[in-house]
């Protein structure tokens, strides 16, 4: 079976939510909080491979772990999977779970799962809680707006 067209080059971005929380890993889970002192070095950059026109793959750790949307029964959850972002293909059906649709609004960006329509990448209002997915982006319970800045 053909593997499908590989995606374009990976770029590193800094991401933080509109409450200024940055991402870091805790027990192999992606968490958002206010890092301080020497812990600021734990901040996870987001590795991005764009897919035309507004979709992208999202990874961390130099693209060695990727964010995906997984449905299991009634549960929809964000998962970190140990796959290489540059091995993903926009044309492979099984890679769709790694794709997110980027929507920009002024200086902020939202990320909707392509495989789980209506589910958005989010953080909790409280610090040091897992990054997750919500299907209620306008309820104000979870934060779905992010600042997304190409890393220098």
């Amino acid at each position: 079976r053909p593997s499908g067209r590989k995606s374009s080059k990976m770029q590193a971005f800094r991401i933080w939510d509109v409450n200024q929380k940055t991402f870091y890993l805790r027990n192999n889970q992606l968490v958002a909080g206010y890092l301080q002192g020497p812990n600021v070095n734990l901040e996870e950059k987001i590795d991005v491979v764009p897919i035309e026109p507004h979709a992208l793959f999202l990874g961390i750790h130099g693209g060695k772990m990727c964010l995906s949307c997984v449905k299991s029964g009634d549960e929809t959850r964000l998962q970190l999977e140990a796959v290489n972002i540059t091995d993903l293909s926009e044309n492979r059906k099984q890679d769709k779970r790694f794709a997110f649709i980027r929507s920009d609004s002024g200086p902020t960006t939202s990320f909707e799962s392509a495989a789980c329509p209506g589910w958005f990448l989010c953080t909790a209002m409280e610090a040091d809680q897992p990054v997750s997915l919500t299907n209620m982006p306008d309820e104000g319970v979870m934060v779905t707006k992010f600042y997304f800045q190409e890393d220098e």
């Epitope: 800094r14 409450n19 890092l35 002192g37 902020t108």
Partner: antibody, heavy 119, light 109 residues
Framework: QVQLKESGPGLVAPSQSLSITCTVS????????VHWVRQPPGKGLEWLGV???????HYNSALMSRLNISKDNSQSQVFLKMNSLRTDDTAMYYC?????????????WGQGTTLTVSS | QAVVTQESALTTSPGETVTLTCRSS?????????ANWVQEKPDHLFTGLIG???NRAPGVPARFSGSLIGDKAALTITGAQTEDEAIYHC????????VFGGRTKLTVL
């Protein structure tokens, strides 16, 4: 263009409460944070607190027990409330926008409102 | 709470390069303190110049630049102009709060 404008009571008696409103235009409070900063006469700036775009607030720890910051996104207004006022709270009070770049803050400022705490 | 200190006053001449610094009581200033620099002109006119250590705010002339020099944050004005005479404030970020320094009165003679 981006504008912020503070409005306050001017004169407040000691032990009373203060309420200042910052009305913004040219940007959305759902995309940018707003800081409150004050400057006592002849002194430097003192950061009071911030309300981020997502609604979370952070405060100067020395003033936290007396401060409350809130906002109304639809009215483009941010509110500073401060209780148990003392004479050393006499200052110019400013609101300032927090920029969208990471921690790139205080890019636009209001013209300030004078607060005098005196009996 | 951390204490942030700046030079109280500096004097320069038009066309010269001048550097203002910002020191933290907690140790070396790093990029994680996201130093911000704000200019204050008469009649309470404040303008953000630099954010995030070295990001120039929109519309700020290129002669203003931010950096880290040694253990301090720095604002350098390359080719100072008479209109740069003002008070300059720096602010440093400590996890989830900002602390302003004293202030530096810059005279351009």
């Amino acid at each position: 263009q981006v504008q912020l404008k503070e409005s306050g009571p001017g004169l407040v008696a000691p032990s009373q409460s203060l309420s200042i409103t910052c009305t913004v235009s040219g940007f959305s409070l759902t995309s940018y944070g707003v800081h409150w900063v004050r400057q006592p006469p002849g002194k430097g700036l003192e950061w009071l607190g911030v309300i981020w775009a997502g609604g979370v607030t952070h405060y100067n720890s020395a003033l936290m027990s007396r401060l409350n910051i809130s906002k109304d996104n639809s009215q483009s207004q941010v509110f500073l409330k401060m209780n148990s006022l003392r004479t050393d709270d006499t200052a110019m009070y400013y609101c300032a926008r927090g920029g969208a770049l990471l921690r790139s803050h205080f890019d636009y400022w209001g013209q300030g409102t004078t607060l005098t705490v005196s009996s | 709470q951390a204490v942030v200190t700046q030079e109280s006053a500096l004097t320069t001449s038009p066309g010269e390069t001048v550097t203002l610094t910002c020191r933290s009581s907690t140790g070396a200033v790093t990029t994680s303190n996201y130093a911000n620099w704000v200019q204050e002109k008469p009649d309470h006119l404040f303008t953000g110049l630099i954010g995030g250590t070295n990001n120039r705010a929109p519309g700020v002339p290129a002669r203003f630049s931010g950096s880290l020099i040694g253990d301090k944050a720095a604002l350098t004005i390359t080719g100072a102009q008479t209109e740069d005479e003002a008070i300059y404030h720096c602010a440093l970020w400590y996890s989830n709060l900002w602390v302003f320094g004293g202030r530096t009165k810059l005279t351009v003679l």
